[in-house]
Interface confidence: low
């Protein structure tokens, strides 16, 4: 509440609830393929209608509790720890029918000196320690299990990661009377998905690992790592997936340079630089055979890491991210925007969607934005038509029963979803902008002109009289 | 034991200035952002001022912003609150109250001590 | 600011059965997960009393007949079943961005 900077902050609680053993996945029913909404998509409410319907009809055949809950377990290796000395945990709501698996790492940005981090300990206690947490968290967006916030896999075993390791999901250094806090984010997975197996992720035929921010690009750093565990201790048949929320990022040019002061205005590159020593960072092993010893930071950058992941990564990223923006030291104050940082917003558009050419699944809206997957309206964005659950369908369809991508993609069921258009909310199915000097919601209209963008020129590539795309922005449409 | 002990209540008159102080005991009182509240006689609680456990942040009603100051000596453990141009309708018990790390509720509250401003 | 509104102000229920106490807030007090609503209980001549937190957590100590739901700015306090002692005054107090801010208060009344 107070101050705070981060890309997602959450979380606190007492002692943890006494602990209640899954019983074992042996003998669950072999889940049916994913429901294939082509047939309906002219009519989704009425068909959600129908499975909400069949779904309550059902419920007195279910043990479940028709509860939103993830509930927290604190990890019993309590060696393995968030940057206090506290034990690290989970949140998790289990789905006994189902053997998918949602493990969702949680973002926050991330510190690299004692000064930042006494800082972040300071006033977001929440991302560096445990000692608070609350004992039961609501899944929201992909983590829920309605199946009208979440149509893509609301019936999967939930698992929500609290981040509070500071690291990007990177480290790997304990605390010691050196080091005065522990940096465990890559442990913190491993010993998660450990303690899992022994409640049920044993018998599951997917692991999808996701992450918002920080935790996107932990998805990245760690999705090869997951499944590389689960095959040396003997469960080669689970299939391991990413999805990266809000996670790709470029080391570009500074808008305006600043010294490597703070989180905020320290240069990406130069942040990651500096951490990867101070937090003992690992980064995927075939990247890091790409690069020579020290620059190991080039791993942390989606585009440079994606071409050496082994397991399929389905990759969202607004293409004007606000935390790009941030440490890019963008800042879109109460002022008109000048024409050389409409440009520079512009062309980080332009490179963000150059980078993901060649990544056959991605979710990439024209939208000033940050995060989305675990966002209630998550369903309400479309790229082409298509909303981000459905593309994620159809990536499971293009997957099934196979590790690699599909080379030709399903009929009418796409996967690589990059906004062409050129400004930020060219797409009209964006989510509202704010001022972020005055928190006053603005319409497309005005947020474009607020940008500098001259509607003689933002209309002319679409072939629209000013007038024109002006009446079709203030519609929505 | 977990306290919060306020003391510095008095009867002073419009206009006047009065100090309250908060002695913590029980816990590190460093590692927690303090609050100060209100309630007026047969009234509902007020929120005061937040002061976060480095003093980084300071935070205040609207009402009572310029009138009072919120202070911390984590060395000594006690919480201030320096108020000035009291007006009558700051008549109230006033409490500390320890901030739950992150969550912002108050899940340690002082026994209160009482300001009464009138002339 | 972030306006609660409690009802009813005031409540009578018989010894045994179920108290239900509303709170609605002018604006979402939730994000990305967490509710940032909570509930204190407050007996004449004391301090209030931290009962739930972040909308459904029971603060340790306190009895599991009080519980809380809700998310958005919809949010319940129940107690069942209703005992002597629980005759006292109730608020809700949000935390989502400052200030924070609390309900009106309901007063419980045992028959």
């Known amino acids: 509440s107070e101050g705070r900077k981060t890309w997602r902050r959450r979380g606190q609680q007492p002692p943890p609830p006494p602990r209640t053993e899954a019983a074992p996945a042996a003998g669950q029913p072999v889940e049916s393929f994913p429901l294939d909404f082509t047939a309906v998509e002219g009519n989704m409410d009425s068909f959600m209608a129908q499975v909400k319907s069949l779904a309550q009809s059902l419920y007195p055949c279910s043990a479940q509790q028709l509860n939103e809950d993830l509930r927290l377990h604190l990890l019993l290796d309590t060696s393995v720890t968030c940057n206090d000395g506290s034990p690290a945990g989970y949140y998790l709501k289990e789905s006994r029918g189902s053997r998918r698996w949602l493990l969702f790492l949680e973002g926050g940005w991330y510190c690299f000196n004692r000064e930042n981090c006494d800082s972040r300990y300071d006033t977001m206690r929440r991302l560096m320690s445990s000692r608070d947490w609350p004992r039961t968290r609501t899944g929201t967006g992909i983590l829920s299990s309605q199946p009208e916030e979440n149509p893509y896999w609301w019936n999967a075993n939930m698992v929500f990661i609290p981040y509070c390791s500071s690291d990007v999901w990177s480290g790997a250094s304990s605390k010691s009377e050196k080091n005065e806090y522990a940096f465990m984010g890559a442990l913190i997975i491993q010993e998660v998905v450990r303690e899992l197996l022994g409640r049920g992720l044993s018998g599951a035929k997917v692991l999808l690992l996701a992450g918002s921010s920080a935790g996107g690009t932990g998805v990245l750093l760690n999705v090869d790592r997951v499944a590389e565990q689960l095959e040396k201790l003997g469960y080669p048949a689970i299939q391991v997936r990413g999805l990266a929320d809000s996670g790709w990022f470029l080391d570009n040019k500074q808008y305006r340079h600043t010294d490597c002061v703070d989180t905020i205005t320290c240069a990406p590159t130069e942040a990651i630089r500096r951490g990867i020593r101070y937090w003992n960072g690992v980064v995927p092993e075939r990247c890091r055979r790409q690069f020579q010893e020290g620059e190991e930071w080039n791993c942390f950058f989606g585009y440079k890491v994606y071409p050496t992941l082994r397991c399929p990564v389905f990759v969202v990223q607004w293409l004007f991210d606000e935390a790009q923006l941030t440490v890019d030291n963008v800042h879109l104050t109460g002022q008109p925007v000048q024409e050389g940082l409409r440009l520079y917003i512009q062309n980080l558009g332009r490179e963000l969607r150059h980078t993901l050419k060649d990544v056959p699944a991605s979710f990439a809206p024209a939208c000033l934005s940050h995060e989305i997957i675990i966002r209630s309206h998550w369903t309400d964005v479309q790229v082409k038509g298509t909303s981000l659950p459905r593309a994620l369908h159809c990536w499971d369809r293009s997957l099934h029963d196979s590790h690699k991508a599909s080379k030709t993609p399903l009929k009418g069921c796409p996967v690589h979803l990059v906004d062409s258009c050129p400004w930020p909310h060219c797409n009209p199915s964006c989510p509202t902008v704010r001022d972020q000097f005055t928190g006053q919601e603005m319409n497309v209209a005005q947020f474009l002109m607020h940008m500098g963008f001259d509607m003689q020129t933002v209309a002319q590539p679409q072939g629209l009289e000013p007038s024109e795309l002006l009446g079709m922005l203030s519609n929505g449409s | 034991e977990v306290q919060l002990v306020e003391s510095g209540g008095d009867l002073v008159k419009p206009g006047g200035s009065l100090k309250l102080s908060c002695a913590a005991s029980?816990?590190?009182?460093?590692?927690?952002?303090m609050h100060w509240l209100r309630q007026a006689p047969e009234k509902g609680l007020e929120w005061v001022a937040y002061?976060?456990?480095?003093?980084?942040?300071?935070s205040y009603a609207n009402t009572m912003k310029g009138r009072f100051t919120i202070s911390r000596d984590n060395a000594k453990k006690t919480l201030s609150l320096q108020m000035t141009s009291l007006r009558s309708e700051d008549t109230a018990i006033y409490y500390c109250a320890r901030k739950n790390y992150n969550g912002g509720y108050f899940d340690v509250w002082g026994t209160g001590t009482t300001v009464t401003v009138s002339s | 600011d972030i306006v609660l509104t409690q009802s009813p102000a005031s409540l009578v229920v018989s010894l045994g059965q179920r108290a239900t106490i509303s709170c609605r807030a002018s604006?979402?007090?939730?994000?990305?997960?967490?509710?940032?609503m909570h509930w204190y209980q407050q007996k004449p001549g004391q301090p209030p009393k931290l009962l739930i937190y972040?909308?459904?957590n029971l603060e340790s100590g306190v009895p599991a007949r009080f519980s809380g739901s809700g998310s958005g700015t919809d949010f319940t306090l129940n107690i069942h079943p209703v005992e002597e002692g629980d005759a006292t005054t109730y608020y809700c107090q949000h935390s989502r961005v400052l200030p924070p801010t609390f309900g009106s208060g309901t007063k419980l009344e045992i028959k």
């Open positions: 604006k979402s007090v939730s994000e990305s997960g967490y509710s940032y």
């Open positions: 029980g816990f590190t009182f460093s590692d927690y952002g």
């Open positions: 972040l909308a459904s």
């Open positions: 002061i976060s456990s480095g003093s980084t942040t300071l």
